[in-house]
């Protein structure tokens, strides 16, 4: 058959959730402490909660069923009787009070025909307002009747007919009536909730809904340029072109700011957007979502998006709407012709309307975005540039900050990139130029996105002229080649002169993309004395295990997941894996990861790495190469403490400094 | 055949010198790192100091470090051991001992020792 | 440095039975690149220079005989001599090339019971 509707599917779960009572016993689930009931999906009955409150479970007879005394469930069919009978039925006895006042409804209801009557539940009427309740019954109760009518259409309407956005033709004056059929299985009538539904009659259908519904007459435009509330609202529309849309056809919901609302904005962040028509038309489009939303149908936490493209958290709690978890909805369900109005006392500045100093303000940077305040880059997080703000996360500084000085003020700047970025149009092997004057290469691995060392850490905040990327650490730029680096350190003094010795000098400051697990003067020393005068008495084994150091990609830590297979200049592949923020090549600890360089990274290790396949075997006829003499002059690995002649005297001293 | 054959041992007084040498022949001397190992009399075995193929790496046990100096002469297919400040733990049978190849490894071939008495 | 501690120091065994001797470094001879066990085992008689039997904890020297063996993995190491002969009775030393300074046990010696 056809697919079922939202309401169907719903009623469905309550049934089998209701079954082990008994046949056609549905579950309920009541609000405790108020009379708010409702079937139940899947999710609400696991966490036994309906706008964060606690419910309870109760059993009830399923719609048109009936119990028997000494049986189990509701096995009997409710007898059919007519309209008027059948609104008894369902507990809707006001109304049937209402429609004997009237005088001509009741024969109607008890004539022939068919109808489909909304009718509101006890509760609903005691809660209108003593002057509304007046008015209704004065004069000569046309007033009621019309009210009555507007709650009818003049056939028989089943839910599976009831479609989201549909309009039914009521029997007052032809008014329409609005529907909205949510994918939760609420269904209501001008936002007014279909309690208990499809109640047959002989002469049509009985739909309980939990409020009085009234005719609407104003679109969306009017109702904002009637109400003294959104005075600035009003302004801020017609100074956007939008009042052309909130006055045409659709079905919108305006969580329209009130005056109060704008007025909590500081007074430069307003006149700035004000302003500024694009930022205008973002921050009112980011007011108004595509669809007519009303209150009843939020029962838990929803996403929606909004004209702007911004996603909000609609939800509740008790009976408060909250947006984004605030319960800024102070009135709702205001209906107009082509949408619904919820008034809300705090403005939703939307990403696109902010500078980058407010972006900041709402992430988890602040520490950053004071360090460039006090290096004097303020004025380009809050101008009208095109940039990108590379911010690290607070927890970068947990150690502290660095002091503001030349140094800490260029690398701020180059933090800063010259062009607004959106990061899902970045690619690897893209150079971006920094205020600094540096070019920063992009990286893409499989799990991240990485600008040098540093990696995007959340999604990309993009702002009116700037776009905030959050990254998981300070960003080094490279300052020389993977030899330079090696080279201006003094950890690798061996290391170089290996690299020296087996002719790899070239290959690491030629451009290039390169992994280098670069070994200190420790891990050299640690090698077993065989091992080592292994590597120094053989050129092609010493260039090997070095080759086997490089890896052919550049790879730092951010890009790594949980486990990456580098391959080596040598041939084989390293593995390189992340556990517990530590990186490890070949299940040994890296001791400093991400020191970049313009032709690759250096990862310092402690340990030499042996190549699987060129593990040493021992053979006693082999032949080695001759001896490496630049190597050996600058190596660590003698203990000795007089020398040769042939050593020359800086060599000489660094011998003494590495000796055992 | 390997052949390692020590002179110059003999008896000495505290702080004095002696020179040791290791003549070898049978192999080609040059390719092999060589070491001094002594014995104590009546103990076990003490490694005393290594030199590399090409005479560049050389390492001393602590107890000889800055006393003892390790040297070979690759064209007298010659090993040497010049030892000053002598102390009387440093009587001993000292042996000049052949690695396993080119590189540094275990010790293969030995000669038959030469002894030194340190005494007043 | 490496501690390399033999035991027992007096082994007494009849000729044609079975001799073993153990050895305990004081850390690990097993490099993990390589996955040898960087340990050698020396005989010494009286008066003369010591020989090498065994390298690599199990690799036995050219003219070796197959009697000699030797076993063991990172800290504990045996040799075996499965047979023993006349020429067999003399001091057995392990020693471990895998840091400086190299060391030596202080040698187990084997008697004729």
């Known amino acids: 058959g056809p697919a079922k509707s939202p309401y169907q599917l719903v009623l469905q779960h309550s049934r089998l959730r209701g079954r082990q009572h008994g046949p056609n016993v549905c579950a309920v689930q009541k609000v405790i402490g108020t009379n708010r009931k409702y079937f139940t999906n899947c999710k609400q009955w696991y966490q036994r909660k309906i706008c964060g409150k606690s419910t309870v479970i109760s059993y009830e007879c399923c719609p048109g069923y009936e119990k028997v005394p000494g049986e189990k469930g509701c096995p009997a069919a409710l007898p059919l009787s007519n309209l008027y009978e059948t609104l008894g039925v369902v507990g809707s006895t006001t109304t049937q009070l209402y429609t004997d006042r009237t005088e001509k409804l009741r024969p109607e209801m008890e004539g022939p025909g068919s109808f489909t009557i909304f009718a509101p539940s006890n509760e609903a009427w005691a809660s209108l307002p003593a002057e509304v309740l007046d008015s209704l019954v004065s004069n000569v109760n046309i007033e009621l009747l019309n009210a009555l009518r507007y709650h009818m259409v003049g056939r028989r309407v089943l839910t599976d007919e009831l479609k989201h956005g549909m309009t039914l033709t009521s029997m007052y004056q032809n008014s329409n009536i609005q529907i909205h059929h949510y994918p939760n299985g609420i269904v209501t009538v001008n936002c007014a909730r279909l309690l208990k539904a499809d109640h047959h009659a002989t002469n049509g259908v009985v739909h309980l809904i939990d409020k009085v519904i009234s005719t609407i007459t104003n679109n969306i435009q009017q109702i904002i340029e009637i109400e003294d509330t959104f005075e600035t609202l009003r302004a801020a529309v017609a100074a956007s072109g939008l009042n052309t849309m909130l006055e045409g056809n659709g079905q919108y919901t305006l969580l329209a700011p009130t005056n109060e609302a704008f007025e909590k904005i500081p007074s430069e962040t307003l006149n700035r957007i004000l302003g500024d028509p694009e930022a205008l038309r973002d921050l009112l489009n980011n007011h108004i979502l595509k669809s007519a939303m009303c209150a009843e149908a939020i029962v838990a936490g929803l996403s929606v998006e909004t004209l702007e493209g911004t996603t909000l958290e609609v939800g509740c709690s008790g009976d408060m709407l909250t947006i984004n978890g605030k319960a800024i909805i102070s009135n709702k369900d205001i209906l107009a012709t082509n949408g619904v109005i919820h008034y809300i006392d705090e403005l939703l500045i939307p990403d696109s309307a902010k500078t980058l100093f407010e972006l900041a303000a709402e992430s988890d940077v602040s520490t950053a975005i004071d360090l460039f305040r006090q290096a004097g880059l303020g004025n380009h997080l809050s101008g009208s540039e095109r940039l990108t703000l590379l911010a690290p996360l607070n927890s970068v500084f947990k150690d502290g900050t660095p002091p503001i000085d030349a140094h800490t003020r260029n690398l701020l700047r180059n933090h800063i990139i010259k062009d607004q970025l959106a990061s899902k149009y970045l690619y690897h092997g893209q150079t971006l130029e920094t205020l600094g004057g540096k070019k920063l290469r992009v990286f893409v691995y499989r799990n991240s996105l990485c600008i040098e060392n540093s990696c995007i850490a959340a999604h990309d905040k993009r702002g009116r002229y700037g776009t905030l990327f959050t990254m998981d650490r300070v960003l080094t730029p490279p300052m020389g080649t993977v030899m330079d680096v090696l080279k201006g350190d003094n950890r690798f003094s061996m290391l170089v002169a290996a690299i020296q010795s087996a002719g790899l000098t070239e290959t690491l400051n030629r451009e290039g993309v390169y992994t280098v697990f670069a070994p200190t003067n420790e891990a050299f020393r640690a090698l077993p004395p065989r091992e080592r005068s292994r590597l120094l008495g053989d050129a092609k084994e010493l260039a090997n295990i070095l080759k086997y150091h490089i890896g052919d990609e550049i790879l730092v830590s951010g890009g790594i997941g949980a486990l990456v297979r580098l391959k080596s200049l040598q041939g084989d592949k390293l593995e390189v894996s992340l556990k517990n923020n530590v990186v490890s090549v070949n299940k040994e600890p890296v001791a400093e990861p991400d020191i970049m360089a313009t032709n690759g990274v250096v990862h310092v290790i402690t340990n030499v790495l042996q190549p699987p396949a060129n593990r040493p075997q021992e053979r006693g006829d082999e032949l080695a190469d001759s001896a490496l003499e630049i190597f050996k002059q600058a190596s660590a690995f003698s203990r000795a403490s007089q020398r040769s002649v042939r050593l020359a005297p800086v060599y000489q001293k660094l011998l003494e400094r590495m000796k055992h | 055949q390997v052949q390692l054959v020590e002179s110059g041992g003999g008896l000495v007084k505290p702080g004095g010198s002696l020179r040791l040498s290791c003549a070898a022949s049978g192999f080609t001397f040059s390719d092999y790192y060589m070491y001094w190992i002594r014995q104590a009399p009546g103990k076990g075995l003490e490694w005393v100091a290594t030199i590399s193929d090409g005479g560049i790496y050389i390492y001393y046990a602590d107890s000889v470090k800055g006393r003892f100096t390790i040297s070979r002469d690759s064209a007298k297919n010659s090993l040497y051991l010049q030892m000053n400040s002598l102390r009387a733990e440093d009587t001993a049978v000292y042996y000049c001992?052949?690695?396993?190849?080119?590189?540094?490894?275990?010790?293969?071939?030995w000669g038959q020792g030469t002894t030194v008495t340190v005494s007043s | 440095e490496i501690v390399m501690t033999q035991s027992p120091a007096t082994l007494s065994v009849s000729p044609g039975e079975r001799a073993t001797m153990s050895c305990r470094a004081s850390q690990s001879l097993l490099y993990s690149s390589n996955q040898k066990n960087y340990l050698a085992w020396y005989q010494q008689k009286p008066g003369q220079a010591p020989r090498l039997l065994i390298y690599?904890?199990?690799t036995r020297e050219t003219g070796i005989p197959a009697r000699f063996s030797g076993s063991g993995s990172g800290t504990e190491f045996t040799l075996t001599i499965s047979s023993l002969q006349s020429e067999d009775f003399a001091v057995y030393y392990c020693?471990?090339?895998?840091?400086?300074?190299?060391?030596f046990g202080q040698g187990t010696k084997l008697e004729i019971k």
């Open positions: 690599w904890a199990s």
């Open positions: 020693q471990q090339y895998y840091r400086y300074p190299y060391t």
């Open positions: 001992v052949r690695g396993w190849d080119r590189y540094d490894s275990w010790f293969a071939c």
